[in-house]
């Protein structure tokens, strides 16, 4: 799995997609979870609706609402009031059973003003061991990096 | 063991430039945010920087914002700080620490031993 | 700009004394405070984070409590190695800053 990267700013809400193949996770609940370690657990923020049917409907945990419209395959997770505890790594998993498969690999990150963080076009050079690539853009600061980049947690 | 050197320090004239380093090693430097934290002779501790794993988010103290810059480049496990139009009130002892959440935030866990910078006529 | 004030500035204290110094935020930063420990002529030690949670390797006679905007650090009983200065920081809400410090001193 790549890893995308969110950045939102403080004291706003940030809104995380997470797209995945709609016939292949049908039934499937979805879980939103946070990376504690390089080998530690996925530890469950928040999840769908258990009934499956009534995924659409908004569940929250704190600040941290989840929503996921089966049909057209995409989880979307708002962490509102962004702080700088809220960055880290996370995940979108879909549940089967005690079961959970990766969706989306995510690194949150917060910036304390929309002019403290630096274009794509103006990040660190990679070494040569590494890589980076724009891939896309889902939000204005939205991207992806290559497993190369940085090193990922196992999925758990 | 998890360890962070300092080095790059020196007496400097006011305006001038000074790039600071700190190496890191017994860790996985790219998991962690990294940062710079500085303390003028007699004085408390003022943070100055910090730098996101990936180095793409970065915050800066207004009192430096705009004259010091910094960088990581973790292939070489390393983190700068590069300082220009230095003033008198600059002078402090630099420390590089390790923010002790997993790609994120937290308390510095882990200090150098600080390197001195004197800006000074 | 969340402000931190630590009292004492200063505490003269006797080895195997308890020491109970004060952190206050000019507004709640939850319980994301850390304390920091500094010898002359050292770095900083974090001691304590999230408040309540011992570093790793500090012993059992530092402990920390509070949340919001008032926090405390107690050691239970004082040993000669513990006469430094003394951090608190917060790290809820940008620009992350830190009190001005308490001296612990003997007396």
């Known amino acids: 799995h790549n890893t995308t990267v969110f950045q939102g700013v403080e004291g706003q809400s940030l809104q995380v997609s997470c797209p995945y193949d709609s016939m292949k996770h049908w039934g499937r609940r979805k879980a939103w979870c946070r990376q504690l370690g390089e080998k530690g657990p996925c530890q469950r923020v928040v999840s769908t609706h258990n009934l499956w049917l009534l995924s659409f409907l908004r569940r929250r945990n704190g600040s941290t609402a989840i929503t996921d419209d089966t049909l057209g395959g995409t989880l979307t997770i708002t962490l509102r009031n962004l702080q700088p505890h809220d960055a880290g790594f996370y995940q979108c998993q879909s549940l089967h059973g005690s079961e959970a498969d990766t969706l989306r690999k995510v690194l949150v990150e917060v910036l304390a003003d929309p002019l403290d963080h630096r274009d794509a076009g103006d990040l660190w050079v990679p070494g040569e061991s590494e890589s980076f690539e724009d891939a896309h853009v889902e939000h204005s600061i939205s991207r992806s990096l290559l497993e190369g980049e940085i090193p990922f947690p196992p999925t758990s | 063991q998890v360890q962070l050197v300092e080095s790059g320090g020196g007496l400097v004239k006011p305006g001038g430039s000074l790039r600071l380093s700190c190496a890191a090693s017994?860790?996985?430097?790219?998991?962690?945010?990294m940062s710079w934290i500085r303390q003028a002779p007699g004085k408390g501790l003022e943070w100055v920087s910090y730098?996101?794993?990936?180095?793409?988010?970065?915050y800066y103290a207004d009192s430096v914002k705009g004259r010091f810059t910094i960088s990581r480049d973790n292939a070489k496990n390393s983190l700068y700080l590069q300082m220009n139009s230095l003033r008198a009130e600059d002078t402090a002892v630099y420390y590089c620490?390790?923010?002790?959440?997993?790609?994120?935030?937290?308390?510095?866990?882990?200090w150098g031993q600080g390197t001195t910078v004197t800006v000074s006529s | 700009e969340i402000v931190l004030t630590q009292s004492p500035a200063t505490l003269s204290l006797s080895p195997g004394e308890r020491a109970t110094l004060s952190c206050r935020a000019s507004?709640?930063?939850?319980?994301?405070l850390a304390w920091y420990q500094q010898k002359p002529g050292q770095a900083p030690r974090l001691l304590i984070y999230?408040?309540?949670n011992r570093a790793t390797g500090i012993p059992a006679r530092f402990s920390g409590s509070g949340s919001g905007t008032d926090f405390t650090l107690t050691i239970s009983s004082l040993e000669p190695e513990d006469f430094a200065v003394y951090y608190c920081?917060?790290?809820?809400?940008?620009?992350?800053?830190f009190g001005g410090g308490t001296k612990v001193e003997i007396k």
């Open positions: 620490a390790r923010l002790g959440g997993y790609y994120s935030l937290g308390p510095m866990d882990v």
């Open positions: 017994g860790f996985t430097f790219s998991d962690y945010y």
């Open positions: 730098i996101s794993s990936s180095g793409s988010t970065i």
């Open positions: 507004q709640s930063v939850s319980s994301y």
């Open positions: 999230d408040a309540s």
């Open positions: 920081q917060q790290d809820s809400a940008f620009p992350f800053t």
